[in-house]
């Protein structure tokens, strides 16, 4: 049986979480992929997703989350920049494969963000706040609103993308701004 495992990352406010999710190249290269948060007792919430079909090495940014899908490496790179204490939680990468259930990629990430920073003199601990401004050409994919295949009431929408501008940042601390996607039980 596949055992769900977690990998813990302890970071300070202002720093960047940078993880890579490994997937089967031949199977999932162009599949839509998503970054989700799992809160206790709740369904996973999708915070950001790639376009559909997923584009190779094409950054998709939703607020402080940047997704890059490297098809030729079978890797989804996820960065959460300028971390806030409120970002602490359990996260996972998934691959959408309708009408089947999303495919979860190992490992889940247990993010712990604490106040302040423990830098060495001269280290650019908070540089990510400046480095990762949203470029005007970065696309922001709309994530599909899937319901459980056992109770499907609507088909997943066709791929839609709009242009993200520097002032369109989503604040992850405001849960009303999170793209909410019910995923399967």
């Amino acid at each position: 049986a596949t055992k769900l495992t977690e990998e813990k990352y302890e970071l300070k406010e202002g720093q960047t979480l940078d993880v890579k999710c490994d997937y089967t190249l031949e199977k999932f290269a162009s599949s839509q992929k998503a970054w989700q948060i799992i809160r206790d007792g709740e369904m996973p919430k999708t915070l950001a997703c790639t376009e559909r079909p997923s584009k190779n090495s094409h950054p998709v940014q939703v607020g402080r989350i940047i997704l890059e899908d490297y098809h030729d490496h079978g890797l989804l790179r996820v960065r959460m920049v300028n971390l806030q204490v409120e970002d602490s939680g359990l996260y996972q990468c998934v691959i959408y494969q309708p009408p089947k259930e999303p495919h979860m990629l190992f490992d889940r990430i247990r993010l712990v963000v604490t106040k302040g920073f423990s830098g060495t003199p001269g280290s650019n601990e908070n540089s990510t706040q400046n480095v990762y401004k949203i470029p005007p050409t970065t696309t922001k994919a709309l994530c599909p609103l899937y319901t459980s295949p056992r109770t499907v009431t609507q088909a997943p929408p066709k791929s839609t993308a709009d242009v993200s501008t520097p002032d369109s940042e989503i604040n992850l601390t405001n849960v009303t701004d999170i793209i909410r996607v019910p995923v399967f039980n």
Partner: antibody
Framework: EVQLLESGGGLVQPGGSLRLSCAAS????????MSWVRQAPGKGLEWVST????????YYADSVKGRFTISRDNSKNTLDLQMNSLRAEDTAVYYC????????????WGQGTLVTVSS | EIVMTQSPATLSVSPGERATLSCRAS??????LAWYQQKPGQAPRLLIY???TRATGIPDRFSGSGSGTEFTLTISSLQSEDFAVYYC??????????FGQGTKVEIK
């Protein structure tokens, strides 16, 4: 408990071949990339090769490209390294290492197997 | 390819003292850095990853800091079992992921 056990090391002449194996247990083998890292006597660590969990993606250090082939059998939980056209500078302890689930660092290591290339 | 440079090559410290090891990357790697400990005749062991996070079972006297190009591994109070060689390794993206040349921590 994660366990990695290498085998197949030994003495081989320059230009010869050798196949290293690593038997893995204690984790969901096909969910993780695996690597070979080597260490020449008295020297530092040198990354050699990595293979993705499904086996669909492989990476090699320039020093071994075209001579070494990494492969895995997910049904048997084994990782292999086929080494051809061996050179004296390939002499090292070869470690099998499990790649972490979130990034390309190594969270578990085998005990290593010594490969000596000498005439 | 990113070059990782560790300093000093050898660090002589008395038991109970603090040890500070440095690792520098030739280009920014954000916090994509791991530290390993290797004792003679043994395989390396993961200490720190993501520049700051201690691996499972690693005592809290080991701590990592830094980001970008400059990183530090600090051992707050050296125990006899801490005398070993320490390596840093970058993992900014896919391989090759390079190691530093190592710092040997020896008894003063």
């Amino acid at each position: 408990e994660v366990q990695l056990l290498e085998s197949g090391g030994g003495l081989v002449q320059p230009g010869g071949s050798l196949r290293l194996s690593c038997a893995a247990s204690g984790f969901t083998f096909n969910a993780y990339a695996m690597s070979w890292v080597r260490q020449a006597p008295g020297k530092g660590l040198e990354w050699v090769s990595t293979i993705s969990g499904s086996g669909s993606t492989t990476y090699y250090a320039d020093s071994v490209k075209g001579r070494f082939t990494i492969s895995r059998d997910n049904s048997k939980n084994t990782l292999d390294l086929q080494m051809n056209s061996l050179r004296a500078e390939d002499t090292a302890v070869y470690y099998c290492a499990k790649v972490a689930g979130s990034n390309f660092f190594f969270d578990h290591w085998g005990q290593g197997t010594l490969v000596t290339v000498s005439s | 390819e990113i070059v990782m440079t560790q300093s000093p090559a050898t660090l002589s410290v008395s038991p109970g003292e603090r040890a500070t090891l440095s690792c520098r990357a030739s280009q920014s790697i954000n916090a994509n850095l791991a530290w390993y400990q290797q004792k003679p005749g043994q395989a390396p062991r993961l200490l720190i990853y993501g520049a700051y996070t201690r691996a499972t079972g690693i005592p809290d006297r080991f701590s990592g800091s830094g980001s970008g190009t400059e990183f530090t591994l600090t051992i707050s109070s050296l125990q006899s079992e801490d005398f070993a060689v320490y390596y840093c390794q970058e993992f900014i993206l896919f391989p090759p992921n390079t190691f530093g040349q190592g710092t040997k921590v020896e008894i003063k």
